[in-house]
């Protein structure tokens, strides 16, 4: 038995930020779950992970350098991605896993969301020269 996931087919990140909502056919209340967002057709990059536990507040991690946050609904997790680069335009897949207690449960692979990062090109800020000597 697999969980079904719904996500928008396309989102545009105008200011290098976007909210991606993952809606599940499963109530996460009172479950220990792991919601994650994966980049690329092969889902090779785990962008962001949200750990949920009925007795603790959400824990959000990215081990791949993304600036992300997460918000929990009864049957959804919304990922808020910031500081996206134009070259991070790609397809992103929601994944949900009920980790404990067993049996493990996860989702049918969704159709994904194409995130088109449009806005400003994020560049490292220029190094300002120090005060010039007289």
């Amino acid at each position: 038995n697999k969980i079904l996931v719904k996500q928008s087919p396309m989102l545009v990140a105008y200011d290098n930020a976007v909210n991606l909502s993952c809606k599940y056919s499963y109530n996460l209340f009172s479950r220990e779950f792991r919601a994650s967002l994966h980049k690329g057709l092969d889902s090779a990059v785990e962008v962001c992970v949200v750990y949920g536990n009925y007795s603790q507040q959400l824990q959000v991690y990215s081990k791949t350098g993304f600036n992300c946050d997460g918000k929990l609904g009864n049957e959804s997790v919304t990922f808020y991605l910031q500081n996206l680069y134009v070259n991070q335009t790609d397809i992103y897949f929601c994944k949900i896993e009920v980790m404990y207690p067993p049996p493990y449960l996860d989702n049918e692979k969704s159709n994904g969301t194409i995130i088109h990062v449009k806005g400003k090109h994020l560049c490292p800020s220029p190094l300002f020269p120090g005060p010039s000597k007289p």
Partner: nanobody, 116 residues
Amino acid sequence: EVQLLESGGGLVQPGGSLRLSCAASGFTFSRYHMAWVRQAPGKGLEWVSVIDSLGLQTYYADSVKGRFTISRDNSKNTLYLQMNSLRAEDTAVYYCAEYGGAFDYWGQGTLVTVSS
């Protein structure tokens, strides 16, 4: 070829400690959640503990909570189970296994006997 090789079992007195290891090979260990499962003599399989792929989240059966600690070293492709305050009812064959995901691989197990 996927292999999971457990070690570290043995005979220990009640209240003692053991550390089990599971060496993984043949797959990208860091991408998979892992678990320890045990089977006591004449009984069914019991999930003991689960750790997620990043090693950031752990889960324990009530029977071992506060006594056992699961961990992993993705750079060494190794899963661990630190078992403290062992009891006679912890006597079992302990297996490491991939948890969830696309395939279901188990090791051959290591026997832990808790007896005075």
